[in-house]
């Protein structure tokens, strides 16, 4: 069955920095979405070889692509605190196939030590169930942030 390899699992970056998310498949795609998860999932990009990519207005002017739809690296620039979240690749084939997710933690420079990624993939959270015609890795991607120290305030 088709799979999407997504990396990294998690990354911590300061405000204003960039992050690379790579979505790799064995080919045979119609295209690929990068979606920010949450109660109201938000498409960030849709990329299809030979077609002008669609980019959400929030990220317009700060997204770059390299590679092809089968092995796509998406670079998000000038990250803001509000960009913190879990991003998942959705490959469109004859079914929907999902990556394992990338948890992006955007921190103010002085608070970087408070929130850092563990080695584990993003942990499962209250995500919508995938469509029935979909292939989704188990466990599902996570959108939960690591627990901060009691004294800290998350943005």
């Amino acid at each position: 069955a088709q799979e999407v390899q997504q990396s990294p699992h998690c990354t911590t970056v300061p405000v204003g920095a960039s992050v690379n998310i790579t979505c790799s498949t064995s080919g045979g795609l119609r295209g690929i979405y990068l979606r920010q998860l949450g109660p109201q999932p938000q498409d960030i990009i849709y990329y299809e070889d030979g077609v002008v990519p669609t980019t959400d207005r929030r990220f317009r002017g700060r997204i770059d692509f390299s590679g092809s739809q089968d092995n796509l690296t998406i670079t998000m620039h000038r990250l803001q605190l509000s960009d913190t979240g879990t991003y998942t690749c959705q490959a469109i084939t004859e079914v929907n196939v999902y990556g394992s997710g990338t948890l992006v933690l955007v921190t103010e420079e002085q608070s970087q030590g408070w929130h850092r990624c563990s080695d584990a993939p993003p942990r499962a959270s209250a995500l919508p169930a995938p469509p029935t015609g979909s292939a989704l890795p188990d466990p599902q991607t996570a959108s939960a942030l690591p627990d901060p120290p009691a004294a800290s305030a998350l943005p």
């Epitope: 119609r30 979405y33 109660p39 004859e94 469509p131 029935t132 015609g133």
Partner: antibody, heavy 117, light 107 residues
């Protein structure tokens, strides 16, 4: 059981506006792309618009700039705002669950929009 | 846009007959083809997706085949409840486009 129920159709004059709604039940609405397809009286099917689960929107050239598709995941609802309506927009409008970017596996019962002076 | 040409536009066959409907795309669609059935006065229903996959609950007398630009829907043994209009639809590229339909009647 997955159910889609359209509403909001009716008679409108050319140049007028109408907002169609589609209430979904029996599915995790936020996980699915959704589409509108129309069928003019005695004619075939025509795709109108789609919205991905993450909110990207796509339109047929015939409605681009006049129609707006939107969704409210909290209300399990899909919408089609139709402006500057023309006689040729007269049709039954169906909402459909878009299982895999174009594979429309569940359809509502349809709502009739008539544009006439 | 990808044009979908369906033929015949209508046909009349006897109960038990094998019925074949064809759909031709103006460019290759990589098997991203669906077939829908619409009975008179009713809502379209998905029959076959991705060229040959039978949608749940669809009788096994329906089958689909094809590749590239040419696709076929076959009803192996026509039944009274198969009286309907059948539409093909490509979903390889936006905009999604439908064939003009084939009306199937019983002789």
């Amino acid at each position: 059981e997955v159910q889609l129920v359209e509403s909001g159709g009716g008679l409108v004059k050319p140049g007028g506006s109408l907002r169609l709604s589609c209430a979904a039940s029996g599915l995790t609405f936020s996980s699915y792309a959704m589409s509108w397809v129309r069928q003019a009286p005695g004619k075939g099917l025509e795709w109108v618009a789609s919205i991905s689960s993450g909110g990207f929107t796509y339109y047929a050239d015939s409605v681009k700039g006049r129609f707006t598709i939107s969704r409210d995941n909290a209300k399990n609802s899909l919408y089609l705002q139709m402006n500057s309506l023309r006689a040729e927009d007269t049709a039954v409008y169906y909402c459909a669950r878009d299982e895999v970017r174009g594979y429309l596996d569940v359809w509502g019962q349809g709502t009739l929009v008539t544009v006439s002076s | 846009d990808i044009q979908m040409t369906q033929s015949p536009s209508s046909l009349s066959a006897s109960l038990g007959d094998r019925v074949t409907i064809t759909c031709s795309a103006s460019q290759g669609i990589s098997n991203y083809l669906n077939w829908y059935q619409q009975k008179p006065g009713k809502v379209p229903k998905l029959l076959i997706y991705y060229t040959s996959s039978l949608h749940s609950g669809v009788p096994s007398r329906f089958s689909g085949s094809g590749s590239g630009t040419d696709y076929t829907l076959t009803i192996s043994s026509l039944q009274p409840e198969d009286v309907a209009t059948y539409y093909c639809q490509q979903y390889s590229k936006l905009p999604y486009t439908f064939g003009g339909g084939t009306k199937v009647e019983i002789k």
